[in-house]
């Protein structure tokens, strides 16, 4: 359950960014679809995005939109929204005219004289706003994901192109590039841009090399770059860790399997509120850290870090981020202490050396000093505790 973003870090995604400079290409985007190449058609009118009129949506416009977005052609006409049935005529003559209201509420249309985006124009107030929306699914359904990082917001970068998931080469890979990935996935901003071998290597094709984003692009495939054909191997697969990714550690105990529960989230380490810290949450954490099961939940100490995270688990989840959770950005945990846990693999119980992390457990190391990408494109240096 992703929590709402705090005011100082809005969870921006493709929805907030213009795809093109004015006049360069169609001011069009697709929303509420399975990827950036399918969904409801919206057109840009000065400062706002408006749903395109479904009544005037046709196969030429669909084809032009898909091409303009770099998504191949449109799927077969049967996949498009069907033509809108004729609307009933207005009230009988003599009634008050509704034309002024209709014009104020009118929806824009994308009208195309051919299947090429240069042959299209946006016409304002072309339709009555009757709720019918233009939709399209394009042939080359591009998508993006982060894999093998312990959650949807960290891992190896993979793009879906031509029906195949593939990697991105880490040559020139930096925070600007990772920022585009994080924002596109709704994962906040980039905390780290990682070179190859931080995550398990990919197996498929390598779709991109020499990626060079400005950081403002809506989609990773809008960034300048080269096809990743010849010069990269999977040892060079690019990775990213985004601000919405959660990773955990236990501090102040005998070893890494005992101590105060801390979660790295949105660029800083936070303590967890013990007012909702029960055996089920402790069990999930211990198992996800490769520390066995929870033995004890010692009485917590006052919060030494900003304590804002709450979890509610049923005990069967793989990680705490799979549980119901909320991040209270405005208040520290009220009248609670910092959650603590003692896991069964701790040497304070067994007088053993620190256990190895099982190979199946994927950990993400947050370096002690990282440059964090903020929405206003300033960089800030955070010293992590």
């Amino acid at each position: 359950h992703p929590s709402p973003a705090p005011p100082d870090q809005l969870n921006t995604s493709s929805a907030e960014s213009e795809l093109w400079e004015p006049g360069e290409r169609l001011p069009v985007r697709l929303t509420n679809g399975s990827s950036s190449c399918s969904g409801t058609v919206e057109v840009r009118l000065e400062a706002s995005w408006e749903p395109a009129c479904g009544a005037l949506w046709d196969s030429r416009a669909a084809e032009a939109v898909c091409r303009a977005l770099g998504c191949g052609g449109a799927e077969a006409a049967s996949q498009l929204a069907p033509p809108t049935p004729e609307l009933p005529p207005p009230p009988a003559a003599g009634n008050t005219s509704v034309a002024a209201n209709a014009t104020l509420a009118g929806a824009p249309a994308l009208l195309c004289s051919g299947a090429e985006w240069r042959l299209c124009e946006v016409v304002e107030h072309a339709c009555r706003s009757d709720g019918r929306r233009a939709r399209v699914t394009c042939a080359e359904n591009r998508a993006l994901r982060l894999v093998d990082g312990g959650g949807a917001c960290a891992g190896r970068v993979e793009m879906l192109e031509h029906g195949e998931w593939g990697s991105v080469c880490d040559d020139t890979w930096d925070l600007e590039d990772a920022h585009v990935v994080c924002r596109q996935l709704g994962c906040g901003w980039a905390v780290q841009a990682l070179p190859g071998l931080h995550f398990t290597p990919g197996r498929g094709p390598i779709h991109r090399d020499q990626v060079n984003c400005s950081g403002a692009e809506a989609y990773l495939w809008d960034c300048p770059g080269l096809p990743g054909q010849h010069y990269c191997g999977h040892k060079e697969d690019a990775g990213a860790v985004c601000s919405e990714h959660q990773s955990w550690r236990l501090t102040g105990g005998a070893d890494r399997c005992e101590g105060q529960v801390e979660v790295h989230f949105r660029g800083v380490w936070n303590t967890v509120c013990d007012s909702e810290w029960y055996p089920s949450e402790a069990k999930v954490l211990c198992q996800s850290l490769g520390c066995g099961t929870a033995v004890e939940r010692p009485k917590g100490l006052p919060h030494s870090l900003s304590g804002r995270m709450y979890y509610s688990c049923n005990g069967e989840e793989l990680t705490l981020s799979n549980c119901s959770w909320r991040f209270n950005n405005s208040n520290l945990c009220s009248q609670s202490l910092a959650a603590r846990v003692l896991c069964s693999a701790s040497r304070s119980l067994h007088n053993l050396s620190t256990p190895e992390v099982p190979a199946s457990v994927q950990t993400v190391t947050i370096e002690s000093s990282v440059t964090v990408k903020i929405e206003n494109k300033e960089s800030r240096e955070l010293m992590l505790l």
């Epitope: 009544a55 005037l56 034309a99 002024a100 249309a109 016409v123 107030h125 072309a126």
Partner: nanobody
Framework: QVQLVESGGGLVQPGGSLRLSCSAS????????MGWFRQAPGKEREFVSA????????YYADSVKGRFTISRDNSKNTLYLQMNSLRAEDTAVYYC????????????????WGQGTLVTVSS
């Protein structure tokens, strides 16, 4: 029921001008988006131009862009098409159309058609 009556057609030389008019019977004329279609001999009916309810938005077929101008006078319940720089290929029957739901660019949204007026461009 909206009655649409076109007028202003006729014979004109290439390069000449004509102004077509379409008079609507309906007092709520301003509730309809209006437009023009045409059909040349032996060809399919094709879109020419459209205008929204109050005239703030217009759209033209590429073949007439820059030569034809659509306008409307809601106080007179009348639609106009000013045709300049006429060419032989503009020869067709011109139909006035009205649409309640959307600008009449595609035929499936059109509610009413006029009977048509013939425009012949020939030397």
């Amino acid at each position: 029921q909206v009655q649409l009556v076109e007028s202003g057609g006729g014979l004109v030389q290439p390069g000449g001008s004509l102004r077509l008019s379409c008079s609507a019977s309906e007092r709520t004329f301003s509730d309809y988006a209006m437009g023009w279609f045409r059909q040349a001999p032996g060809k399919e009916r094709e879109f020419v131009s459209a205008i929204n309810w109050v005239g703030g938005s217009t759209y033209y077929a590429d073949s007439v862009k820059g030569r034809f101008t659509i306008s409307r006078d809601n106080s007179k319940n009348t639609l106009y098409l000013q045709m300049n720089s006429l060419r032989a290929e503009d020869t067709a029957v011109y139909y006035c159309v009205a649409s309640w739901g959307a600008m009449p660019v595609l035929t499936h949204v059109i509610n009413y058609w006029g009977q048509g007026t013939l425009v012949t461009v020939s030397s």
